[in-house]
């Protein structure tokens, strides 16, 4: 009688958990005349066996991490050894159990971050691997910060993406990190499998040393310019610098002046492009912006203040 565990020779797929000692047959193939014996070939790994009568079984526990799928072929042979049916493909899919620990690729990581870096922008990745199936919770990793040293006012300056292991600054970290006060930090980071959701999960830890570097993206001191300068223009009046080379600089005039007499070059040097007249306008406020190669702002705009100084160029009026 055909059923769950017996039937004719045809392509079939079976799923078996790894790590389990064999407890029952996989399948009993029924022979059609003149088949008197069965033959098993393919990725048997000396684990899978078929008896003459068509009883397919395995003789020891499987390991998915050694082979996740066993591609076998079964043929039915007659008394002369002639294949009379098949060979047909028999696929054994080995189902995963949580039998492997996650492991960090490094026991120690080192990185650096600029003060005032954008919150949530990764500056370092930690990475762990787990040999278990990433399509199951067994191989799904969950990263978290265990300790931050020093911990000032109980405020976390660093955060980690639980899924990717990307480390970035928190909002507080972006605002408060100051290399002059504290130039280095240490994080202890853990990784757990089972998506971090199970008491039975395996874990590993790693250490991360972080150096905080100075942010040179700072607003320059206010500039004072003498009106009606006769020097050749443009004249460099100040500069801004992004923390890394390759930034694209621009100026933003929020006042929408009919005449905006300032420019910036790709070194971050700011120029006045024509003589200024204090009687026309005695102060300018505009912004310097740094963008990446895709035109995305790298940080907040810097406010530039220019004050126009008077010269005695107007007669008194009664």
């Amino acid at each position: 009688q055909e059923g769950k565990f017996s039937g004719p020779l045809k392509p079939m797929t079976f799923s078996i958990y790894e790590g389990q000692e064999p407890s029952q047959i996989i399948f009993q193939f029924k022979a059609n005349p003149p088949a008197v014996t069965f033959e098993l070939t393919g990725e048997t790994d000396n684990i899978f066996v078929i008896e003459r009568e068509g009883l397919l079984y395995y003789n020891r526990a499987l390991d998915r991490e050694t082979r996740s799928t066993h591609n076998l072929q079964v043929a039915a042979l007659d008394a002369n050894g002639i294949i009379v049916e098949g060979p047909v493909p028999i696929t054994i899919k080995v189902k995963d159990i949580n039998d492997n620990r996650p492991t960090f690729l490094q026991s120690k990581y080192e990185g650096s971050v600029r003060q005032n870096s954008r919150p949530g922008k990764p500056f370092l990745y930690v990475n762990a691997t787990d040999l278990d199936d990433p399509a199951t919770p067994n191989g799904q990793l969950y990263y978290q910060i265990v300790i931050q040293l020093p911990m000032i006012n109980n405020v976390m300056y660093f955060q980690i993406n639980n899924k990717t292991g990307a480390i970035s600054l928190t909002r507080e970290g972006s605002q408060e990190l100051n290399p002059a006060k504290n130039p280095s930090y240490n994080l202890v980071i853990s990784v757990k499998d089972m998506g971090g959701q199970s008491e039975n999960s395996f874990s590993d830890t790693t250490s991360v040393d972080i150096i905080v570097t100075e942010n040179i993206w700072k607003a320059p001191k206010p500039v004072e310019m003498v009106e009606n300068s006769t020097d050749p223009h443009p004249i460099k009046i100040t500069q801004v610098r992004w923390n890394d080379p390759g930034a694209q600089y621009s100026l933003v005039d929020k006042e929408k002046l009919p005449r905006f007499p300032f420019s910036i070059d790709q070194e971050g040097d700011i120029y006045v492009t024509q003589p200024l007249d204090r009687e026309e306008k005695d102060a300018y406020v505009f912004y310097a912006v740094a963008k990446d190669e895709y035109g995305k702002p790298l940080s907040y705009p810097l406010e530039i203040h220019v004050k126009v100084k008077d010269i005695n160029d107007n007669p008194p009026t009664c």
């Epitope: 005349p33 008197v36 008394a79 002639i82 294949i83 009379v84 049916e85």
Partner: antibody
Amino acid sequence: EVQLVESGGGLVQPGGSLRLSCAASGFTFSSYAMSWVRQTPGKGLEWVAVIDSNGGSTYYPDTVKDRFTISRDNSKNTLYLQMNSLRAEDTAVYYCSSYTNLGAYWGQGTLVTVSA
Amino acid sequence: DIQMTQSPSSLSASVGDRVTITCRASQDISGYLNWLQQKPGGAIKRLIYTTSTLDSGVPKRFSGSGSGTDFTLTISSLQSEDFATYYCLQYASSPFTFGGGTKVEIK
């Protein structure tokens, strides 16, 4: 409906040759091992040749070995039996029969007479 | 070679009779036995395979049994269309061999 139709039988002199054909239809011929069985009044039914589904393996009993050759053309769904050095005792009705699922399908037979 | 001895070689029976045909192998054939029917016109049909499994479309009045060396084909209630010659066939060992046949005739 499964059909096996033999042809090519007839009268042949001892030492002569004959080629039998069997046209198959109604089943997946290329998946089946096939065979020729003969029936004589004296010896009854006797297996004379077997070929596997792709033509890679053949089997003959000692009575016909080295004289008969079984072959197949799966593209034409046809089985063949080349008979050489024929003897009087090869006189029989020759049946084409499925070997996979042994004896499930049979042709109507073709008569081969070996006589001077 | 394995010899297959069939008995009787012929029998006469009437419609409705119970008919039993036996086949004895010269050695154990592990149940690897088929039963065939050949009508007077020459057409051959398999009735039973692997000792006792009925082919599809074969009436339930036919049954097969046996083990080791002794096997039986039984027709529980003979019908007019059952008058034919019956052969056993062993496929346990090469060369496959047939019994000599049992001709069932009308009494």
